[in-house]
């Protein structure tokens, strides 16, 4: 079965710093979303080989990519306190598959000692349930993102 390996499980960074999240799969996917979990999950990026990536406007000018959709590293720059949260990779395959999640803790520089990551991965219960449908979603319409490629700061 298709799996998404995601790292790191957790990272603590000061305001203004950058963080790398890596999503790796065994291939055979259409594309990959990075989704911020929460009461209203939000798609942060959509990446597909050969397609101009899409980035949510909140991250305008703050995202970089390296690698390919099978082994993608996403860099988020100039982190803000409001960026704190759990980010999960979602591979678009015949059945959507989720990574284990990365908890990003953005802290004020002075209070870094107060917030530390444990070694345990984010709790699985925090992840959304996989979709029931098996049809390939169309990333042009299915995402919370407006149609992929449509602005930001880098197509």
């Amino acid at each position: 079965a298709q799996e998404v390996q995601q790292s790191p499980h957790c990272t603590t960074v000061p305001v203004g710093a950058s963080v790398n999240i890596t999503c790796s799969t065994s291939g055979g996917l259409r594309g990959i979303y990075l989704r911020q979990l929460g009461p209203q999950p939000q798609d942060i990026i959509y990446y597909e080989d050969g397609v101009v990536p899409t980035t949510d406007r909140r991250f305008r000018g703050r995202i970089d990519f390296s690698g390919s959709q099978d082994n993608l590293t996403i860099t988020m720059h100039r982190l803000q306190l409001s960026d704190t949260g759990t980010y999960t990779c979602q591979a678009i395959t015949e059945v959507n598959v989720y990574g284990s999640g990365t908890l990003v803790l953005v802290t004020e520089e002075q209070s870094q000692g107060w917030h530390r990551c444990s070694d345990a991965p984010p709790r699985a219960s925090a992840l959304p349930a996989p979709p029931t449908g098996s049809a390939l979603p169309d990333p042009q319409t299915a995402s919370a993102l407006p149609d992929p490629p449509a602005a930001s700061a880098l197509p």
């Epitope: 050969g50 101009v52 899409t54 406007r57 000018g61 390296s66 490629p149 880098l154």
Partner: antibody, heavy 125, light 107 residues
Framework: EVQLVESGGGLVQPGGSLRLSCAAS????????MSWVRQAPGKGLEWVSS????????FYADPVKGRFTISRDNSKKTLYLQMNSLRAEDTAVYYC??????????????????WGQGTLVTVSS | EIVLTQSPATLSLSPGERVILSCRVS??????LAWYQQKPGQAPRLLIY???NRATGIPARFSGSGSGTDFTLTISSLEPEDFAVYYC?????????FGGGTKVEIK
């Protein structure tokens, strides 16, 4: 007012090198992607390369891949295009262009708006 | 590579006439199509983005429509300053590509 001023064009022999610069003003340069687009004399527009706001991610058109390098110095508010192994078919006016400034949109690369006035590169022996 | 085909290559018209320019795309680009205007000796200027949105400062006589693979730019009534070359561009896939352009000239 946003301003983009290209420089560095000129006459160069086939196989030679040239570095184009694009000095930006009137906006927060470090927050926007930038691109190079060229236009051969009497011809249409051809996208050459784009670079993310941080400079860490770059994209190239196949005809220039491996020969051209896009880069930026955000502290100097300047975009560069290093052109090596130049060929006659690289002869063109080279424009730098800023990512469109619309917060209502999302995406990693937006439309080209505005453009600089262009600088002419002529590759000939 | 996505190929954009503009037609006609040249249009000879008079001020006040209505203009419809076509841009046909080799595969779907959703709504990720823009139109630029270029006058002789000048840099291109963004007119329409995401198929139908007018860029800042662009007069209402310019409008865009279409979806998928067929797009049009309409100028409701040609003004003397509208005589120029018009290019469409997609940014759905790499590489970013432009159409060959349509020249709108004075009859």
């Amino acid at each position: 007012e946003v301003q983009l001023v290209e420089s560095g064009g000129g006459l160069v022999q086939p196989g030679g090198s040239l570095r184009l610069s694009c000095a930006a003003s009137g906006f927060t340069f470090s927050r926007y992607a930038m691109s190079w687009v060229r236009q051969a004399p009497g011809k249409g527009l051809e996208w050459v390369s784009s670079i993310s706001a941080s400079g860490a991610t770059t994209f190239y058109a196949d005809p220039v891949k491996g020969r051209f390098t896009i880069s930026r110095d955000n502290s100097k508010k300047t975009l560069y295009l290093q052109m090596n192994s130049l060929r006659a078919e690289d002869t063109a006016v080279y424009y730098c262009a800023k990512d469109q400034d619309f917060d209502i949109l999302t995406g990693y690369l937006n439309w080209f708006d505005p453009w600089g006035q262009g600088t002419l590169v002529t590759v000939s022996s | 590579e996505i190929v954009l085909t503009q037609s006609p290559a040249t249009l000879s018209l008079s001020p006040g006439e209505r203009v419809i320019l076509s841009c046909r795309v080799s595969q779907s680009v959703s709504s990720y199509l823009a139109w630029y205007q270029q006058k002789p000796g000048q840099a291109p200027r963004l007119l329409i983005y995401d198929t139908s949105n007018r860029a800042t400062g662009i007069p209402a006589r310019f409008s865009g429509s279409g979806s998928g693979t067929d797009f049009t730019l309409t100028i409701s009534s040609l003004e003397p300053e509208d005589f120029a070359v018009y290019y469409c561009q997609q940014r759905r896939n790499w590489p970013l590509t432009f159409g060959g352009g349509t020249k709108v000239e004075i009859k």
